[in-house]
């Protein structure tokens, strides 16, 4: 895969992932009422990071925001923070990567500057994706813990006034936002890795520059017309491109593993 293609694909994948992270953060269905093995109620509860909602069988849906900061569980605050960090880093990553794209010419920006920016954006996307994945996983862990706690309460007869009145505890299970978040985080991470791979293809080899300084005098060029080109690599773009493409391809083959994030 060419450097431009790898960089472009990395950018697009990260962009899709970033959009998914925003969508997941805004979604109301982080946790949804568990309907399995539960008394069937005519209301359906679901909760997001910012508000909780109730949908009645009449179709009427009412959502209430969490209008408190101090009263919210620390874990929920942490998840919010992780998702926001993911979004902020994603925004910066996108802005940086736009300027870093090889297909976009901005002033007299050389390849080494673009390489640095590509690497920066790649790292930002990687951290953004990891941040989202951690955020979603923390929330999922919180749900699992609460689910089994409420299940234990449900079957140990703790609900109600001394067992006289049955109180049904609403159990919550994974909502759609968790799966969106995991996939989105994974895509952002993969896109970031692709950007980092593309950066290697954009970076001119340091040894080539050293060769230029050793053969700076004009007489060397006169005596060894092909030597200068061969040693610097400036005349051997095709060969170098092949090496970089080979590197990119090999890295891509190794990077087939991170797609496991799509299925977490």
């Amino acid at each position: 895969m060419s450097v431009t293609a790898c960089q472009g694909l990395g950018f697009v994948v990260s962009l899709i992932g970033f959009a998914g992270i925003i969508a997941a953060t805004c979604m109301d269905q982080w946790s949804t009422q568990d309907l399995y093995n539960n008394p069937v109620t005519a209301v359906f509860n679901y909760q997001g990071l910012w508000r909780s909602c109730v949908r009645e069988s009449s179709g009427f849906t009412e959502c209430r925001g969490y209008f408190t900061l101090l009263g919210l569980p620390a874990m929920l605050q942490a998840v919010r923070a992780l998702m926001i960090v993911g979004i902020v880093l994603g925004v910066i990553g996108i802005l940086v990567s736009i300027f870093a794209l090889k297909c976009i010419r901005i002033g007299s920006m050389d390849d080494s500057a673009k390489a640095k920016m590509t690497l920066t954006s790649g790292i930002l996307f990687i951290i953004s994706g990891i941040s989202a994945i951690i955020g979603v996983s923390v929330f999922a862990n919180m749900l699992v813990t609460n689910f089994w706690m409420s299940t234990a309460n449900m079957y140990s007869g703790m609900g109600g006034m001394g067992g006289m009145v049955q109180t049904v505890q609403t159990r919550y299970t994974f909502g759609a936002a968790l799966f969106v978040g995991w996939v989105a985080g994974g895509l952002t991470l993969i896109g970031g890795v692709m950007m980092c791979i593309a950066c290697r293809g954009l970076t001119p080899d340091d040894s080539n520059f050293k060769a230029v300084s050793y053969h700076a005098s004009g007489q060397n060029v006169a005596y060894r017309p092909g030597g200068f080109k061969a040693s610097t690599g400036f005349g051997s773009n095709t060969r170098n491109k092949k090496i970089y493409d080979g590197g990119a391809r090999t890295e891509d083959d190794e990077q087939s593993h991170p797609t496991k994030y799509d299925y977490v």
Epitope: Q33, P39, V40, T41, A42, V43, N45, Q47, S52, C53, V54, E56, S57, S58, G59, F60, E62, R64, G160, V165, Q166, T167, V168, Q169, T170
Partner: antibody, heavy 118, light 113 residues
């Protein structure tokens, strides 16, 4: 104005079946579930079940499973309930009712009186 | 199924009097998601379908006189008529709107002296 117009009274023999209708007007028929309620003379109402006019999905009170079948005709904005294998226990007024906030029944049909008699 | 128990079964009052009737459910009708109680009160006059008075245990349906007030939470609910009028002669039913199957109470018959 929301209106639920039910079909007229029915006198049927034991073991027979009866099908009653409920024509809705004044609102978008497919937007709200239609519920059916049975009320025997001098007794409290009993919820029979509901039908989602949009998807056709139904939910029944276990007591009426196999007894009642709910259907809809979207084109005529009509909900139907068929009762089969009728006995004297099935003699009652049957109401269709449209759900509202709090899952309450704000709109009711005038009722269909079903009398099962030999 | 959720059992709804209403008391008293009948009440005889004079016009202008304050009336309270009770409804108890075998399971809590409080939804934790919105802190609302899914209990409805209906008024049924002879030969008519029930008429919605109160939903969410305390929210008065539009057009219902403000002398009708619903209160309570969880399993214990009350319908209060602050000043009974002659036209309030009817049977009052409470209904569980939270669990399927929806269930009604046996009713409280209000009679005027």
């Amino acid at each position: 104005e929301v209106r639920l117009q039910q079909s007229g009274p029915e006198l049927v023999k034991p073991g027979a079946s009866v099908k009653m209708s409920c024509k809705a007007s004044g609102y978008s028929f497919t937007d709200y579930n239609m519920h059916w309620v049975k009320q025997s003379h001098g007794k409290s109402p009993e919820w029979v079940g509901y039908i989602n006019p949009n998807k056709g999905g139904t939910g029944y009170n276990q007591k009426f499973k196999g007894k009642a079948t709910l259907t809809v005709n979207k084109s005529s904005s009509t909900a139907n309930m068929e009762l089969r294998s009728l006995t004297s226990e099935d003699s009652a007024v049957y109401y269709c009712a449209r759900i509202w906030y709090g899952n309450s029944f704000a709109y009711w049909g005038q009722g269909t009186l079903v009398t099962v008699s030999a | 199924d959720v059992v709804m128990t209403q008391s008293p079964s009948s009440l005889t009052v004079t016009a202008g009097e304050k009336v309270t009737m009770s409804c108890k459910s075998s399971q809590s009708l409080l939804n934790s998601g919105n802190q609302k109680n899914y209990l409805t009160w209906y008024q049924q006059k002879p030969g008519q379908p029930p008429k919605l008075l109160i939903y969410w245990a305390s929210t008065r349906e539009s057009g219902v006189p403000d002398r009708f007030t619903g209160s309570g939470s969880g399993t214990d609910f009350t319908l209060t008529i602050s000043s009974v009028q002659a036209e309030d002669l009817a049977v009052y039913f409470c209904q569980n709107d939270y669990f399927y199957p929806f269930t009604f109470g046996s009713g409280t018959k209000l009679e005027i002296k």
